[in-house]
């Protein structure tokens, strides 16, 4: 008799990352009877949710329904019917609403109740929405990334079934870059963890792992512009602010209310005699490079070494995934390729940066200006923060891989999010039993 | 065993205040959102307000001057305190439990308490 | 206000009838309608969601459709436990409002 297939035995995950900047819905699907095996998850969709972040709603909370609206309904469709109600979904914030939370508790609270409420109202298994702490975005993200590459399974491949890989068990860094906060993650080589904060211990597949994490507030590449333009604009001799870090014929206003909203700017904040200022854009690479070192505190460190503002990081060991907004910008400027080295990066960005404004908006008609002027200074904030902020050199540069997607899913900490607490990832090996679980009678 | 008991419900006359209380178990407020919902003799069902596990509060703009949610999750209640009451305040009213996080529809109910406001 | 309209105040059946109590807002509430049945004495009880989802424990001839402005309830194969007071109700927008309820009796 012919063999038939069963009906699929799937199971499904939704978790949006509500992210500085926006938020993004990310739905995630695996086969039932293998939920233990590492790699089987993957990502079926992602979507954008249309707007900026949610702490951005703070003062209009009542737009928080429609604004999720289409990506809930999106999801909706993508997931068959029959399973929704088994859906779980989770909401973690990040560093948007822990800048939020530091300013107003109670205003934090209100977004995130408001947020609950308009994802309760979905036929989806809601599990509550929550701000994740930077720990656990640097751990989560170091999960994912070495959850797609393989690097928990525990058979030794002879051929290599994603790119990057080396086959081998070694773990990858993984370094994730957002609008508000950017983390660092890695197992660091049979060094001691000098900073309780920052040492992780997981058990995962039988397998132990000590893992190094710091999660730097205010210096995703949003704020860290906030915290430039303040830097700067307290030795402006007037309301003009001659800027490296745009490109030369570039100009915008900025209110200085906007520039000290964020807690980002407090350290540099100062009365100012005027309202607005105007930034002038003269797209000086090595000047914005030179700039932007000043953000970061070097001058102390009360460890064998640090990265910055005193915070312990251990010598860099072995691969790093570097994705989200680290991938978007070096993808834009077309620099992801691994045989790119730090010298040519920084060559391109000499020449991007120096190029006119006008010239600018003729090549990359179809982008938005906001996003398109802001390449020059978040190409070189990612060139600083990674050779002077994180010790990266011209050598140890060709271990960092620009990662978008492993095996068609997002690099991020979401999908690490949503394994844990899925609890789809053993402390133990699973035993094996590859006769358990057949596909066809 | 989720469980919601209302008290505190009595005769009062018009412009006089009143809290009632709704003692919650077998959940936890920090949990999941609690709203009050009324019913008058024969009538249908009228939202009053909902506090949510953060504290957020929402009202049925009709009750918003002068009725108040609030709770004491150490106590596991939550209280409407209801002011300047008026005939057609009269009602039984049931605390009822989000049946998701902090959704708008109830999966379990008190058994309601009533309220009569009359001179 | 969204108004939600169960036009049958009262509605005659019989057991193992196929009942269908309708429900009409004034304005499109996408799915977000729950049902209730409320017998004498006690306090609703959930028994639809998101206009067409079962809640937990609800018998299977209990089932909902509808979506924008007309909702239906559907009883099956009626039974005499089924006799209850039935309410509609929309969470698209505060604030949450309810149906006037529809009465099930026996002919």
């Known amino acids: 008799t012919q063999n038939k297939a069963l009906p699929e035995n799937v199971k499904y995950g939704i978790v949006l990352d509500a992210g500085s900047s926006h938020t993004s819905l990310y739905i995630y699907k695996w086969p039932a009877e293998k939920e233990n095996d590492t790699g089987v998850v993957h990502q079926v969709e992602e979507c954008r949710v249309k707007g900026p972040g949610i702490s951005k709603f703070v003062q209009k909370v009542n737009e928080i329904g429609i604004y999720l609206t289409d990506c809930m309904e999106r999801a909706r469709e993508v997931i068959p019917r029959s399973q929704h109600q088994e859906t779980p979904v989770y909401l973690g914030a990040t560093a948007g609403m822990r800048l939020l939370r530091m300013e107003s508790e109670e205003l934090a609270d209100r977004v995130l109740d408001v947020v609950e409420r308009s994802l309760s109202n979905y036929p989806f298994d809601f599990q509550g929405a929550r701000i994740i702490t930077g720990q656990e975005e640097g751990a989560y993200g170091w999960i994912t990334i070495n959850y797609l590459l393989g690097k928990f399974s525990q058979k030794t491949r002879w051929f290599s079934i994603v790119p990057y890989e080396t086959n081998n068990q070694e773990t990858f860094g993984a370094l994730d870059l957002g609008g508000a906060s950017t983390q660092v993650t890695f197992v660091p080589q049979n060094q001691t963890i000098e900073s309780p904060d920052n040492a992780l211990q997981f058990r995962l597949y039988g397998k132990d792992y000590n893992v190094y994490t710091h999660s730097f507030l205010c210096y995703g590449k949003d704020q860290a512009l906030w915290q430039k333009l303040a830097k700067d604009i307290q030795v402006a001799s007037n309301e003009i602010l001659r800027d490296p870090c745009f490109h030369p014929g570039y100009k915008k206003v900025v209110n200085v209310s906007d520039l000290y909203k964020t807690p980002c700017t407090k350290r540099f904040e100062m009365t100012l005699p005027f309202q607005q200022f105007e930034i002038q854009g003269i797209g000086n690479y090595q000047q914005c490079h030179q700039s932007i070192l000043e953000l970061f505190n070097t001058s102390y460190c009360p460890y064998s070494q640090c990265a910055f503002n005193g915070i312990f990081l251990p010598p860099l060991q072995g691969d790093f995934g570097a994705f989200s907004a680290f991938y978007f910008v070096m993808k834009f400027l077309n620099l992801t390729s691994e045989k790119v080295s730090q010298e040519k990066v920084t060559e391109m960005m000499k020449k991007f940066c120096a190029q006119p404004w006008e010239e600018i908006k003729t090549s990359y008609a179809g982008v938005k200006e906001k996003y398109l002027s802001e390449y020059c200074f978040s190409g070189t904030y990612i060139l600083s923060l990674l050779l002077q902020g994180y010790h990266f050199t011209a050598d140890s540069w060709e271990h960092i891989h620009f990662i978008g997607k492993i095996q068609g899913s997002d690099a991020g900490w979401t999908l690490g999010y949503m394994l844990n607490l899925t609890n789809m990832i053993p402390a133990e090996q699973p035993l094996s039993t590859p006769l358990s679980h057949s596909t066809y009678v | 065993e989720v469980q919601l008991v209302e008290s505190g419900g009595a005769l009062v006359q018009p412009g006089r205040s009143l809290r009632l209380s709704c003692a919650v178990s077998g959940f936890t407020l920090s949990n999941y959102g609690v709203h009050w919902v009324r019913q008058a003799p024969g009538k249908g069902l009228e939202w009053v307000a909902v506090?949510?596990?953060?504290?957020?509060?929402d009202y049925n703009a009709a009750f918003m001057s002068r009725f108040t949610i609030s709770k004491d999750n150490s106590k596991n209640t939550v209280y409407l305190q209801m002011n300047s009451l008026r005939a057609d305040d009269t009602a039984v009213y049931y605390c009822?439990?989000?049946?998701?996080?902090?959704?708008?529809?109830?999966?379990?109910w008190g058994q309601g308490t009533t309220v009569t406001v009359s001179s | 206000d969204i108004v939600m309209t169960q036009s049958q105040k009262f509605m005659s059946t019989s057991v193992g009838d196929r009942v269908s109590i309708t429900c009409k807002a004034s304005?499109?509430?996408?799915?977000?309608v729950a049902w209730y049945q409320q017998k004498p004495g006690q306090s609703p009880k959930l028994l639809i969601y998101s206009a067409s989802y079962r809640y937990s424990g609800v018998p299977d001839r209990f089932t909902g459709s509808g979506s924008g402005t007309d909702f239906t309830l559907t009883i099956s194969n009626m039974q005499s436990e089924d006799l209850a007071d039935y309410f509609c109700q929309q969470y698209n927008s505060y604030p949450l409002t309810f149906g006037g309820g529809t009465k099930l009796e026996i002919k």
């Open positions: 506090i949510l596990r953060r504290g957020s509060t």
């Open positions: 009822a439990k989000t049946a998701v996080v902090a959704g708008d529809y109830f999966d379990y």
């Open positions: 304005q499109n509430v996408g799915t977000n």
